[in-house]
């Protein structure tokens, strides 16, 4: 079998949902010593970066300015050390937002409900679209999809305090081109009296995986690595 290097990690810096005409930044984290990184878009080569010096950095950033629907889609990356290529990274879906119109989001029976009540979100957009998306802020990877001509419903079932938080919806023109976001709707779920004080609110942390953790290797790191390698050999 043909030998390959471990696959790199691809991430979007800050978010994978990029407003049109703004810049997207994708990070490809591979290996120290990689002499070339390639970014692929829908299976075709999109961009190349050759780190300098290659032994000092474990990844690169690819900048995609002026985001539009032609640049929205599935990205992956690979890297090369010497003549040996890595496996392909997982696919990353890059979405362009702020296309066309703004939907309206509402919630029934209302934004303040009791734990156990059934809640339904409604997303309405008069422009022709068939797919709607509901996202909870801080959980942007957990996208709920629903279909309808001008309106879609998102039944949440009996809610718990874990459903608390701010929601937005989008109309989608295809998988990678979304409308402007709706105004947020904040869902407040109160628990049973004896549970209320213990019920955690769902913190809307930023999407912590949407950060680029590229590091430069310092001389000290190199010395420590060499020392550790020597120590391991001595122990053997």
């Amino acid at each position: 079998p043909k030998q390959t290097l471990p696959k790199p990690i691809i991430r979007a810096e800050s978010t994978y949902m990029v407003p049109k005409e703004k810049q997207a930044t994708l990070c490809c984290q591979g290996s120290y010593g990689a002499v070339e990184y390639q970014l692929h878009f829908e299976g075709s080569l999109f961009a190349v970066e050759r780190p300098k010096p290659p032994e000092r950095i474990n990844g690169v950033k690819f900048h995609i300015p002026d985001m539009n629907s032609r640049k929205a889609g599935r990205y992956s990356c690979i890297y090369r050390v010497g003549e040996l290529w890595s496996e392909r990274s997982d696919l990353l879906d890059l979405v362009v937002t702020e296309m066309y119109d703004t939907p309206t989001l509402s919630v029934h029976p209302g934004p303040e409900v009791t734990s156990g009540e059934k809640v339904t979100f409604y997303c309405r957009l008069d422009t022709a679209t068939s797919m709607f998306l509901l996202l909870k802020e801080g959980r942007s990877r957990d996208v709920q999809r629903s279909y309808g001509k001008v309106q879609a419903e998102f039944p949440m079932g009996p809610v718990t305090t874990a459903h608390r938080g701010s929601y937005r919806c989008f109309g989608s023109y295809n998988n990678y081109a979304w409308s402007f976001p709706s105004e947020p709707v904040k869902l407040l779920v109160t628990g049973d009296i004896e549970n209320t004080s213990l019920a955690p609110t769902d913190p809307t942390f930023p999407d912590s995986w949407d950060t680029c953790l590229l590091t430069r290797e310092t001389g000290l790191q190199k010395d420590l690595a060499l020392w550790d390698h020597t120590a391991q050999n001595l122990l053997r």
Partner: nanobody
């Protein structure tokens, strides 16, 4: 707004050479990654060569590697394509393109990456 104007096209015999120039207007040239594409009659536009904004990192299509050289002069806001050992299959309209702005040393290969294009210059290779 960036404007790109190509020049240097013309008719040349197989094995001959040509140098294409692309003059860019605006102060953003130093932050632009640049590329050359070509489109032969009845064919799709294809990538030829590209150069990063700062370190003069380059990338070439396999079909032109070793025969074409891309370079840039940031003082003159110009990118060049030196073409040698020209063949009949190099006949096409050659387009200069820019990605603005860029950071780091990305070299862009996909036409979708480019947000500014020139009008093109025709290169004809025939005996």
């Amino acid at each position: 707004e960036v404007q790109l104007v190509e020049s240097g096209g013309g008719e040349v015999q197989p094995g001959g050479s040509l140098r294409l120039s692309c003059a860019a207007s605006g102060r953003t040239f130093a932050s632009a990654a640049m590329g050359w594409f070509r489109q032969a009659p009845g064919k799709e536009r294809e990538f030829v060569a590209a150069i990063s904004r700062s370190v003069d990192d380059t990338y070439y299509a396999d079909s032109v590697k070793g025969r074409f050289t891309i370079s840039r002069d940031n003082a003159k806001n110009t990118v060049y394509l030196q073409m040698s050992s020209l063949r009949a299959e190099d006949t096409a309209v050659y387009y200069c393109a820019a990605v603005v702005p860029t950071y780091g040393n990305n070299i862009y290969v996909h036409s979708a990456a480019y947000n500014y294009w020139g009008q093109g210059t025709l290169v004809t290779v025939k005996p």
